[in-house]
Interface confidence: low
């Protein structure tokens, strides 16, 4: 999916105001010096690129965050702010139904979510300083 | 490793044309505003062009408005400067310069080639 | 068109503290960048948006900008340290990039 064509402001708006809150409560007992960050974006349409995989395509290690909160928030931001975005993810979200899986938090999804983290505080720099 | 390699560069006279190309590897190209910097022989450091990351957008110093070009091409991970109607004060060193792409706001230089040297001389 | 000016040498000895300054009308309310230039080399970034620094750049080095004056500063000074530090910014009146004139770090 190409998401260029974003409402970014909103999308910002909806990390700022939930998603954010539920990726810390996440992450809570975790120091924040644990996980270097390894992952980066240098644009906006680029950061959801990588939200995205990271946030929903299960890696080796980490096959549950897809239903945490965090999660499901962040796709219906997705959903209402990118044209065209749900229609693109129906098959996944059916073939994710067929795969679920008993919660675990690992130290893998401690890490991914580390990383998730940092994406959005990039997603999120100011553009310019206040004049 | 990432890396981004000018080539292009000579002597050329006044008036003459020269191309200019950057080679990039080792990171997303297509996701990164691109920019020249130029630095003549003993002085500072001059900023030239940028064209964003989907090339949607160019920005020229005013030394060389209308006489230069820039452009990229993603798919092969190549930017370049066409120079028309070259001076002698156009004589520097020209840096291809990458930047995180941001709306309207410029980012931080963070990744340089090592430069090529144009002379522009009689 | 906006401009920044640098002091054009600054001389300081090993184990001090090197104080540099970029002025700019405002300048506080953009997003300044430094560079390090040794001689016959590229320009390497070593402080970022006012004041943060890429992993590689040792903690020495710092940065601060308000008012009209953007700061680098470099502590416990090392001979490695001497070479030129330009300032940068985005002028987004003109949709321009904007060096300052460069300032040459001497270690005594």
């Known amino acids: 999916y190409d998401f260029t064509n974003c409402d970014f402001e909103k999308i910002k708006a909806a990390y700022l105001s939930t998603i954010s809150k539920d990726l810390i409560t996440y992450m809570s007992g975790t120091k924040s010096t644990e996980f270097n960050n390894t992952v980066s974006c240098s644009n906006r349409p680029h950061c959801l690129t990588e939200i995205q995989s990271l946030t929903f395509n299960p890696t080796a290690g980490c096959a549950s965050l897809a239903k945490e909160m965090f999660a499901m928030k962040t796709k219906a931001a997705l959903a209402i702010w990118c044209p065209g975005y749900s229609e693109t993810q129906i098959n996944a979200t059916q073939a994710m139904k067929k795969r679920r899986k008993r919660k675990v938090t690992t130290n893998k999804c401690l890490e991914q979510v580390s990383q998730l983290q940092g994406l959005w505080r990039r997603f999120n720099r100011p553009l310019l300083k206040q004049q | 490793q990432m890396q981004l390699v000018e080539s292009g560069g000579g002597v050329v006279q006044p008036g003459r044309s020269l191309r200019l190309s950057c080679a990039a590897s080792?990171?997303?190209?297509?996701?990164?505003?691109m920019h020249w910097v130029r630095q003549a022989p003993g002085k500072g450091l001059e900023w030239v062009a940028v064209?964003?990351?989907?090339?949607?957008?160019?920005h020229y110093a005013d030394s060389v408005k209308g006489r230069f070009t820039i452009t990229r091409d993603n798919s092969k991970n190549t930017l370049n400067l066409q120079m028309n109607s070259l001076r002698a004060e156009d004589t520097a060193v020209y840096y291809c310069?990458?930047?995180?792409?941001?709306?309207?706001?410029?980012?931080?230089?963070?990744?340089w080639g090592q430069g090529t040297m144009v002379t522009v001389s009689s | 068109s906006y401009v920044l000016t640098q002091p054009p040498s600054v001389s300081v000895a090993p184990g001090q503290t090197a104080t540099i300054t970029c002025g700019g009308n405002?300048?506080?309310?953009?997003?300044v960048h430094w560079y390090q230039q040794k001689p016959g080399q590229a320009p390497v970034l070593v402080v970022y948006?006012?004041?943060d620094r890429p992993s590689r750049i040792p903690e020495r080095f710092s940065g601060s900008n308000i008012g009209n004056t953007a700061t680098l500063t470099i502590s416990r000074v090392e001979a490695g340290d001497e070479a030129d530090y330009y300032c940068?910014?985005?002028?987004?009146?003109?949709?321009?990039?904007?060096f300052g004139g460069g300032t040459k770090l001497t270690v005594l």
């Open positions: 310069v990458r930047a995180p792409q941001w709306y309207l706001s410029a980012e931080a230089f963070d990744l």
């Open positions: 080792g990171f997303a190209f297509r996701t990164y505003g």
């Open positions: 064209i964003w990351y989907d090339g949607s957008a160019t």
């Open positions: 405002l300048i506080g309310s953009k997003l």
């Open positions: 948006d006012d004041s």
């Open positions: 940068q910014v985005w002028d987004h009146s003109s949709d321009h990039v904007v």
